[in-house]
């Protein structure tokens, strides 16, 4: 059975063509009766997102060398595993290179769903608190305060995929008084449009304002952990919630002050040190893997205050998923 | 919200080039493929190629080899085709189209060349 | 090259009415089949991925079978806003080639 997989020739990492490796050979696999189901285990497999599509491998380019052997006739998954070694498979008795599987999971870096590209939070600790900036014909602009609302920070808020608007008639302190062009003011919005550049406003640049006027808004940033798979909300997979998406945490330097910081944000007790076999009964998770060597002192009140790599980097797989057994 | 605008209506003479630009917005550029699809007036449509955005490389179809050019600019999150040697029967509405390697999902709204003496 | 065969050219139909368009591939394609929708003077939309995936936001009275040489377009009950060009494309292998298309109008 195959010892590697990886996904070659797509845009990124968690797409391409199928290649095994095999006693230090890597090959390609026949797509017959390939099918979504397949592609969910080796998404989950590379750490990659959901499943997207089973695109002809034969599409990616450079295509497979000519003495690149095809290694797999068939892949049967039922969706449940966590790896391609894990389904029945066949070997090969007739096929070539025209028929070689291909793979497509969610892009972790990007999709299709719109990117905040026309307003910022600047100045701010991250990107959900800050003073307001908006961009208009490749020019970032400051927003003044005169006719500013909730209404306005809450689409604000909504835009950028942070969580509720908690300050939203702020001034700037001094140190973060803007320095570009002020935008706009008399900004009127109903608090249900999609973008602020959807709200009625005065005219662009024509305005009396200066620049001890320009607004600060602050969201939540909307962090949340979860333990997942347990018996119980304070026992199983350790989930964290970023940018609206739910995802794994790597088990890269994670440890007992690690173990109690989770815990104690989630009210359930002290952390009861599972073993290493315990910690593993609540299988791999699916999708993003956000969080990779988290340190923490054990002082913290929230995973969020630890250290750790940028949110989504790592080099992990869902092998090495952390959990949580708390004293509830 | 997610988008592809193109360059507008060209008109051109017979043996000279024609370079047709494709912004996008609203979705990261470089996760999807970058495909360029014609349609001659009254006629169906015509793959011509795609671009990885991400690396830069193309895959045309072989009709158009040699005489296609897929190139695109991160920075501005657009993508460009150049068609060279043009004959009256290049005159159609080529269309961007983003998407996945094997499908469009997002299309530009189209641009007219017209190639004519 | 993989040559895509529609049919019919076009067809009549009226509100409410199931209609069915086919398409035929010149070798197999297994499921790499998509459906597309155009208007006129507008760009095509994709409806249909994977011979049977719908795709997103497009409405469930539209649906894809098929697998091999032979696949089905279907619209349910057809409605005002359907009537437009139907084409298929393969996405086996490159060059990617479309079907000549089907015009449904009104009856």
């Known amino acids: 059975s195959p010892s590697g997989v990886r996904l070659v020739g797509g845009l990124h990492r968690c797409e391409g063509r199928v290649e095994v490796e095999q006693k230090g050979q890597w090959g390609t696999v026949c797509d017959d009766g390939w099918d979504i189901k397949d592609v969910a285990v080796l998404c989950r497999e590379l750490g990659c997102g959901a499943a997207s599509g089973t695109p002809s491998g034969i599409l990616y380019e450079p295509p497979a060398e000519k003495e690149q052997k095809v290694l797999i006739q068939s892949v049967s998954c039922t969706g449940t595993e966590d790896t391609l070694a894990q389904c029945e498979q066949e070997e090969v008795y007739d096929c070539s290179h025209d028929e070689d599987a291909g793979a497509s999971c969610e892009n972790p870096e990007s999709s299709f769903s719109p990117v905040p590209e026309g307003v910022r939070l600047a100045d701010g600790p991250g990107h959900c608190k800050g003073r307001v900036e908006v961009k208009h014909q490749n020019q970032w602009y400051t927003v003044c305060q005169t006719g500013w609302s909730l209404r306005a920070a809450k689409v604000v808020c909504r835009q950028l995929g942070c969580g509720r608007a908690v300050l939203t008639q702020k001034r700037c302190n001094k140190h973060a008084y803007g320095r570009k062009p002020i935008w706009l003011s008399q900004m009127s919005c109903s608090g249900r449009e999609a973008t602020l550049q959807d709200c009625p406003s005065g005219p662009w640049g024509k305005n009396t304002c200066n620049h001890d006027e320009d607004t600060w808004v602050e969201c939540e940033d909307p962090f949340d952990l979860r333990l997942v798979g347990g018996d119980n909300l304070c026992s199983g997979r350790l989930e964290v919630l970023h940018k609206g998406v739910w995802g794994s945490v790597c088990d890269d330097n994670w440890g007992e002050k690690e173990d109690q910081v989770v815990c104690k944000q989630l009210g359930c007790g002290k952390s009861l040190s599972p073993s290493f076999r315990d910690r593993k009964c609540y299988g791999p998770g699916v999708g993003r893997i956000w969080l990779d060597n988290v340190r923490c002192s054990g002082e913290e009140q929230s995973l969020e205050q630890c250290q750790h790599r940028f949110w989504g980097f790592h080099d992990c797989t869902h092998q090495e998923d952390v959990a949580v057994i708390c004293s509830g | 919200e997610v988008q592809l605008v193109q360059s507008g209506a060209e008109v051109k003479k017979p043996g000279a080039s024609v370079k047709v630009s494709c912004k996008a917005s609203?979705?990261?550029?470089?996760?999807?493929?970058m495909h360029w699809v014609r349609q001659a007036p009254g006629q169906g449509l015509e793959w011509m190629g795609w671009?990885?955005?991400?690396?830069?490389?193309?895959n045309y179809a072989q009709k158009f080899q040699g005489r296609v050019t897929m190139t695109r600019d991160t920075s501005i999150s657009t993508a460009y085709m150049e068609l060279s040697r043009l004959r009256s029967d290049d005159t159609a509405v080529y269309y961007c189209?983003?998407?996945?390697?094997?499908?469009?999902?997002?299309w530009g709204q189209g641009t007219t060349v017209s190639v004519s003496s | 090259d993989i040559q895509m065969t529609q049919s019919p050219s076009s067809l009549s139909a009226s509100v409410g009415d199931r209609v069915t368009i086919t398409c035929r591939a010149s070798?197999?394609?297994?499921?790499?089949l998509n459906w597309y929708q155009q208007k006129p003077g507008k760009a095509p939309k994709l409806l249909i991925y994977?011979?049977?995936s719908l795709q997103s936001g497009v409405p469930s009275r539209f649906s894809g079978s098929g697998s091999g040489t032979d696949f089905t377009l279907t619209i349910s009950s057809l409605q005002p806003e359907d009537f437009a060009t139907y084409y298929c494309?393969?996405?086996?292998?490159?060059?990617?080639?479309f079907g000549g298309g089907t015009k449904v109008d009104i009856k």
């Open positions: 189209a983003g998407g996945r390697i094997d499908a469009f999902d997002i």
């Open positions: 609203g979705y990261t550029f470089t996760g999807y493929y």
């Open positions: 671009i990885n955005p991400n690396s830069g490389g193309t």
């Open positions: 070798q197999s394609i297994s499921s790499y």
């Open positions: 994977a011979a049977s």
């Open positions: 494309q393969q996405s086996y292998s490159t060059p990617l080639t």
